[in-house]
Every structure is written in C-alpha cells, then in structure tokens.
C-alpha cells in the first residue's frame, strides 16, 4: 500500500477555508450526479467522515475520503472531482496508508456507488465545517 507524503500542519483557519471550498465543490458534484435519473442510494457503501477520537482540524478522515473520490474519478471524468482531490491533498497532514476501494463492475452499481458517496461526501463536508466552527468557538471561550 502507498503512503502519502508528510505535510506541515496547517493553521485551523487555512483548514476552514479548504473545507468551505470542498463544501461548495461537493454540492456541485452532487447536483450533477443527481441529474442521472432512476438511481437510488445504496446501503452498501459508507464514506468515513469524522474521527470521534480526534480534535478539529485533525478529525477529518481525509486519506480515506480522498481514496473514495479517486475511485469515483476512475468512473467519471467531471473536472470538479480533480479539484476536490487537489483540496483533499492539502488536508492530509501525516503518513497514511492509502485505502483500497474495490470499484463496482456493474454499470448500474457504478451509478449507485457514485451517487451514494457523493451524497455522503456532501453531508460530510457540512459536518466537518460545523465541527471546525464549533471547535473555533470553544477555543475562544
């Protein structure tokens, strides 16, 4: 398994800007993915989001989220996905083994995978932003 390069920790306001951008991009991706009619979300796929045993901004499961988005990129060439991956790269602060995700082979299952992960990713970025802003409020009180 590959390991991602070590990066310097970013100030939490930098992280917040990145997550705000990711939140916006995730909405764009989901809007486009939802154009594909007749596709239902699947219970078979779960995107890791926030780690309960870490403090913001280190609680975002960026390496795993990035691995799922890279899998979607194998199935879909929307350029917003490249941009999302670039932003997720900035949130990976230490060595982390790359998560291996098996790509669905069935056409309809591909669509379900993309829709499900896109929806969960959008929800995850909402949660991540809330956790960052509430963490920042707690730090100032």
């Amino acid at each position: 398994s590959h390991t991602l390069p070590v990066r310097l920790l970013r100030p939490s306001d930098d992280v917040q800007k990145i997550v705000e951008e990711l939140q916006s991009l995730s909405k764009m991706l989901l809007k486009d993915v939802e154009e594909e009619k007749g596709v239902l979300v699947s219970q078979n796929y779960t995107l890791p989001c926030l780690s309960p045993d870490a403090q913001p901004p280190n609680n975002i499961h960026s390496p795993a989220i990035r691995a799922y988005l890279k899998t979607i990129r194998q199935l879909d060439n929307k350029s917003v996905i490249d941009e999302i991956i670039e932003h997720l790269d900035k949130l990976i602060f230490q060595d982390a083994p790359e998560t291996n995700i098996s790509v669905p082979t069935d056409t309809h299952e591909c669509k379900r995978f993309i829709l499900t992960i896109s929806q969960q990713f959008s929800e995850c970025m909402d949660l991540a932003l809330k956790s960052l802003t509430s963490g920042a409020q707690q730090a100032t009180t």
Epitope: K31, D32, E36, Q74, L75, N77, K78, T107
Partner: antibody, heavy 124, light 110 residues
C-alpha cells in the same frame, strides 16, 4: 433521434473571424457530458481543439495551441455550443466537427455522438 | 505536454488477416480511451470505449485492451469494409491530460 448539427463555416480571409455553432437536437443540455470541437485538415488526422462541460460549472479545456485565438461558449436555452475563431490562418482550413462525450463510464456509448462537420476555408 | 503515440502510421493487410494497432499515452489515462474508424468524407465512428468496451452495433471482430499508458485495438479477421483509418482518443477530461487523438493508422489492401 439525438444529433449535433454544425453551422457557420465558410470562406474567410486570413486574419478574419468566424463563429461556428453546434446545435443539439433530440436531447437537452444536462450534466454528465462534455461537448467538444475537433477539426480535420484535408488529408490529415483528427485534432482536438477544446471541450466544455455541460453541468453546474462550464469547465473548459483547450488544446495548448488553441488558447487565445479560439473560444468556446454555450447557451443552455438554445441547446447550442459555439466556437469563436479569431485571427484565422491558412492552416486553420479544415472540417470542424462538434462531438459529445460522456463524463462517466456508465452507458458510455450513448454519450459518444458526432456531427457531420462544417467546412472552414481560410484563403485570400 | 500530454501525447498519444499511435503505431503503425499505416499498414497493408489482406482480408482475413489479424490486425493490431497500438496507442501509447505519455502518462496514465486510467482506461479513458476510445478507438474510432473513419472513412473519407465521414465523421469518425466509435468502435471501442473505456479501452475495452465494444460500442453498440460494432462487430465482435473488433476488440480493445490495455490499461495505464498502453492500449491496443485488434481486428481478429479483417473484412473488406474494414479498410479505413483508425484513431485512438483519450477523453480523460481533466487534470493535466484532458483530451487528444492519436496520429491515426491507415489500413490499406495488400
């Protein structure tokens, strides 16, 4: 029946401009595909010019040589993509095709669609 | 800059021959590769997409294979209507790769 129809070609003098249109019929502009312009000079190969994404953002990708002189745009209400070509040269003489490509690997071949092409001749 | 290198540029073959055309990308394109057949005065006709999927209505004598940077189009038994020019194309659509065509392979009668 889905189709793409190019128009706007013709003869133009070197240094002149043309605007080509690619009208979609039988389908509407929605997310999940790209519309591209490709050209083919007489007796030569296919040459990609530019693509525009049909979706929530109008992302564009230009061939390096096309940046500056060529501009792609779209009008969703008219289901049409345009190619504005400026400072035309003799070597721009070609048949210009527009084509639709999928943005996903699912149901892919329903997204590959080409027009018949429009002829552009740059000559004094 | 990204490049797709197609070879050979031309080949002569007889009806019934097995024909192989290759396409090499200067960086990985994750199977975002299509093969087309083109005849004079006509737009290209899709044969293969996503490196190995046969387009609807295309005879099974055409097949595609490959991944990463190296791809192949094979015609298992050349038919009279197969004499034409063939192109590979990437439709990766983003990043630093985008789009592009191979230089073409003209298949003529031996």
């Amino acid at each position: 029946q889905s189709q793409l129809v190019e128009s706007g070609g013709g003869r133009v003098q070197p240094g002149g401009s043309l605007r080509l249109s690619c009208a979609a019929s039988g389908f509407s502009f929605s997310a999940n595909y790209w519309i591209c312009w490709v050209r083919q000079a007489p007796g030569k190969g296919l040459e990609w010019i530019v693509c525009i994404y049909i979706g929530s953002r109008a992302d564009t990708y230009y061939a390096p040589w096309a940046k500056g002189r060529f501009t792609i745009s779209k009008d969703n209400s008219k289901n049409t993509v345009y190619l504005q070509m400026n400072s035309l040269r003799a070597e721009d003489t070609a048949t210009y095709f527009c084509a639709r490509f999928s943005s996903g690997i699912y149901d892919l071949d329903r997204f590959f669609l080409w027009g018949q092409g429009t002829q552009v001749t740059v000559s004094s | 800059a990204f490049q797709l290198t197609q070879s050979p540029s031309s080949l002569s073959a007889s009806v019934g021959d097995r024909v192989t055309i290759t396409c090499q990308a200067s960086q990985s394109i994750d199977s975002w590769l299509a093969w087309y057949q083109q005849k004079p005065g006509k737009p290209p006709k899709l044969l293969i997409y996503q490196a190995s999927k046969l387009a609807s209505g295309v005879p099974s004598r055409f097949s595609g294979s490959g991944s990463g940077t190296d791809y192949t189009l094979t015609i298992s038994s050349l038919q009279p209507e197969d004499f034409a020019t063939y192109y590979c194309q990437t439709y990766y659509g983003g990043g630093h790769i985008g789009w592009g065509f191979g230089t073409g392979t003209k298949v003529t009668v031996k």
